[in-house]
Interface confidence: medium
């Protein structure tokens, strides 16, 4: 099993049954009458992790899952039949698939189901403590989830609840057709994205949404979007998927006498991932699959890790992206996307651009306006008309760190944890397949420490079945990882030390960063540990200078 | 209390059109898909389309299809019923119906002639 | 022609107990539910049973549904003459996508 190899071959692969036989993976292997444990929201205060499935919500104790909770929260037969007469699947359509699963306050979570196409929310009781051991449904509060969660559960909905009020980028029609981001509950009239015009979302998919803030003043806090959507016509010649992050001002209210109850402040900029190929032309991963955001010493500027996958059904490949916050924020600043008419190309806007300009949220730091009510005419006919950025944001070192191209599976999901080695910080990323296994990668700064190399750790199978993994989180409290399927969830640990073999240069070539040689085996690595007494190199993986004495 | 109280039938003639309306009343009428069934004279009940909650999907008996268009006005708790191209088979009672996974609860009907 | 297959009348005497069928096939009785609604002489239809057998508030327990296979029932006892009406049963049809109703069954109390 252990290998010593290229980058690209595994250091270590286990199966599924070698990880049962060597206690390395706990399994939740689903109800009999549910599935879909696509929805996670960890809470290492409590040591939870709440899952939303169909027709239920989950809460499993972080130290072992086998130990849950449980709320069924299915749909009326009432809902049930209406839905099959739809003409929609029973089993696959007509049934409450939890979408959003937040923390609402320190009490309550906020969910929301399709409810067999009529989107539902309600709130969820965890009590004030861990120890109340409280998980119940507030069945006397039920509220219309139309612009929360998305009717159909085959569609994907990114949402983010702050200071009591939900974000969601979601489907909000039937048919699957009204894509927009929403601002709802809150005391505020609900916000959305301009309806029925490509320009601002072109048939999206979303992937997540995250609160960055963006100075010292709350008021200039922005919310980020990472969704991949058609190319606009004249964007790219032929049928094109773009990634995107999209920004929109937390205080954002909508205009005045236009764009009322629209955001003012929505821009959206395409995210490139791609490798120089034959010929110049560029082979891009343009899939944007998931998005994970590392927050490290100033929460102003978390490093951007996204997971792309390729177009094309010919050339099967996927990537990972790293993105500065700094440079996403450059193209914000930059020219905006301009035509003169349908059949025009995309240039870089020249013209005069109003004053405040457009996607700068109102506050004291950058302008004199107090809400986005009170902003100009003619900054609102500007906003409504160019909600996208001319430049795209290119990767940290203008290429991927990861690169998959000569297997057969794709990347699905990442998560990235931040581990101090010996000889320095090393991000390490598990990153979800679509067959089942869990990557770990870990990215060794070369010369300089934008210059990245990848090293592929491990490679492990977490379900019994090949099946696509589409949830994960990282408790760093915990020190594991936890999967969701349609399948189930699984639980495995972030370092499996032992198993690297039983002497000091085979745990100084598996260059993991959780571990060391710690005199008589290979073991968790503590930067508190002495140093003398622990051999562990990430950099060169070197054991002739580590392991001779 | 429930209530759906039809309107807009009357006599017509062969081609013609008629729009049939339902007031709703005493339930959170948003919330709830609703149909219209009708029943000729003397004779059985027979169903003729139904609308999503939301207008987001409509169907229709294969008898109406393409002549009849079903919709509602939530801000107004009220469900229409436009008819076009009507035939003397048409004739009959129309009731309007709230769906709850069956007719739960039926208006009165409105009677709708369509004379040659 | 009803896709839904009711036997046009049936009769009884106060305090009897009759039985109404309806037969269908596995695109409606056999793999949706049934409803059975009453409609009285000059009135509009109410539900009588909904989702094979269970009965809406205000439904008196004499009446009871059941269903087996792609058939099902409504029977009626201690019969008064207040329940002389026209009963149907419907049900979703999944091939037709559309709701169905039976012929209807005339019941008598004599």
């Known amino acids: 099993n252990y290998q010593n190899g290229k980058n690209n071959v595994p250091r270590l692969k286990l199966s599924y049954k070698e990880m049962l036989e060597s206690n390395n993976v706990i399994t939740f292997n689903g109800l009999a009458n549910s599935s879909s444990y696509h929805t996670f929201l960890l809470d290492e205060e409590r040591s939870r992790l709440y899952v939303g499935a169909k027709d239920h919500i989950f809460s499993f104790d972080l130290v072992n899952i086998k130990d849950f909770q449980k709320i069924v929260w299915p749909v009326s037969y009432t809902r049930r039949d209406e839905c099959k007469w739809a003409g929609k699947d029973i089993l696959k359509e007509c049934a409450n698939f939890i979408k959003v699963l937040k923390a609402y306050n320190q009490t309550h979570l906020y969910a929301c189901g399709t409810g067999a196409f009529h989107p539902i929310c309600t709130y969820i009781e965890i009590g004030h403590h861990p120890e109340d051991n409280i998980f119940k449904l507030e069945n006397s509060h039920f509220e219309n989830g139309r612009g929360k969660s998305p009717y159909d559960p085959k569609l994907l909905t990114a949402s983010l609840l702050i200071d009591g009020e939900l974000y969601s980028g979601t489907a909000a029609d039937f048919m699957g057709r009204d894509f927009a981001i929403f601002r709802t509950l809150g005391h505020h009239h609900p916000i959305r994205t301009e309806q029925h015009d490509s320009r601002w979302l072109n048939d999206p998919k979303f992937i997540s949404a995250h609160l960055i803030s963006e100075s010292d003043n709350p008021e200039d806090d922005k919310v980020y979007f990472f969704f991949r959507e058609n190319a606009i016509d004249g964007e790219h010649s032929g049928k094109a998927t773009h990634a995107r992050i999209g920004q929109i001002c937390k205080n954002d209210f909508g205009g005045h006498r236009s764009l009322v109850n629209k955001w003012t402040t929505f821009l959206k900029a395409r995210l490139i991932c791609s490798v120089p190929g034959p010929n110049g032309i560029d082979t891009h991963f343009d899939e944007l699959q998931d998005v994970f955001l590392m927050n490290f010493k100033d929460p102003k500027n978390p490093v951007v890790y996204g997971v792309f996958t390729t177009s094309s059904n010919i050339f099967k490949g996927s990537a990972v992206c790293m993105y500065s916050m700094s440079d996403v924020r450059r193209v914000f600043l930059g020219p905006y996307a301009h035509r003169d008419g349908p059949n025009y190309q995309w240039v870089p806007y020249q013209g005069r651009v109003p004053y405040p300009r457009p996607g700068t949220c109102p506050s004291k730091t950058f302008g004199g306006f107090d809400s986005t009510k009170d902003l100009p005419d003619d900054v609102i006919t500007f906003a409504r008309s160019h909600p996208a950025m001319y430049n795209p944001v290119f990767p940290m070192n203008n290429r991927p760190i990861v690169i998959k191209t000569d297997v057969n599976y794709q990347f699905t999901q990442i998560v990235v944890d931040r581990v101090d080695a010996e000889d320095g910080q090393y991000d390490v990323m598990f990153i979800g397949t679509d067959v089942g296994t869990v990557l770990k990668v870990v990215s060794i700064p070369k010369e300089t420490w934008y210059d990245l190399e990848e090293v592929l750790l491990e490679e492990m199978t977490v379900f019994r079945e090949p099946t696509a993994i589409s949830a994960m989180e990282l408790s760093t409290k915990q020190q594991q990882l936890y999967i969701g399927s349609t399948a189930g969830v699984a639980q495995l640990p972030l370092h499996r030390c032992d198993i690297y073999g039983k002497a000091c240069a085979e745990c100084c070539l598996a260059r993991d960063p959780y571990c060391a040689w710690d005199g008589s085996a290979c073991s968790r690595y503590f930067p508190t540990a002495k140093r003398r007494t622990r051999r562990q190199d990430i950099r060169n993986g070197d054991p002739l200078t580590h392991c001779s004495d | 209390e429930v209530q759906l109280l039809e309107s807009g039938g009357g006599l017509v003639q062969t081609g013609g059109s008629l729009r049939l309306s339902c007031a709703a009343s005493?339930?959170?009428?948003?919330?709830?898909?609703m149909s219209w069934v009708r029943q000729a004279p003397g004779k059985g009940l027979e169903w003729v389309s139904w609308?999503?909650?939301?207008?987001?999907?409509?169907y229709y008996a294969d008898s109406v299809k393409g002549r009849f268009t079903i919709s509602r006005d939530n801000s107004k708790n009220t469900l229409y019923l436009q008819m076009n191209s009507l035939r003397a088979e048409d004739t009959a009672v129309y009731y309007c119906?709230?769906?709850?996974?069956?007719?739960?609860?039926w208006g009165q009907g409105t009677l709708v002639t369509v004379s040659s | 022609q009803s896709v839904l297959t009711q036997p046009p009348s049936a009769s009884g005497t106060p305090g009897q107990r009759v039985t109404i069928s309806c037969s269908g096939s596995?695109?409606?009785?056999?793999?949706?539910?049934v409803s059975w609604y009453q409609q009285l002489p000059g009135t509009a239809p109410k539900l009588l049973i909904y989702?094979?057998?269970h009965r809406p508030s205000g439904v008196p327990d004499r009446f009871s549904g059941s269903k087996s296979g792609t058939s099902a029932s409504l029977a009626i006892s201690g019969l008064r003459s207040e329940d002389e009406a026209d009963y149907y049963c419907?049900?979703?049809?999944?091939?037709?996508?559309?709701?169905?109703f039976g012929g209807g069954t005339k019941l008598t109390v004599l």
């Open positions: 119906a709230k769906l709850n996974g069956d007719f739960d609860y």
């Open positions: 419907g049900a979703w049809d999944s091939s037709l996508s559309g709701y169905v």
């Open positions: 609308i999503y909650y939301d207008s987001g999907s409509k």
């Open positions: 596995s695109s409606n009785i056999g793999n949706n539910d």
């Open positions: 005493g339930f959170t009428f948003s919330d709830y898909a």
């Open positions: 989702a094979d057998s």
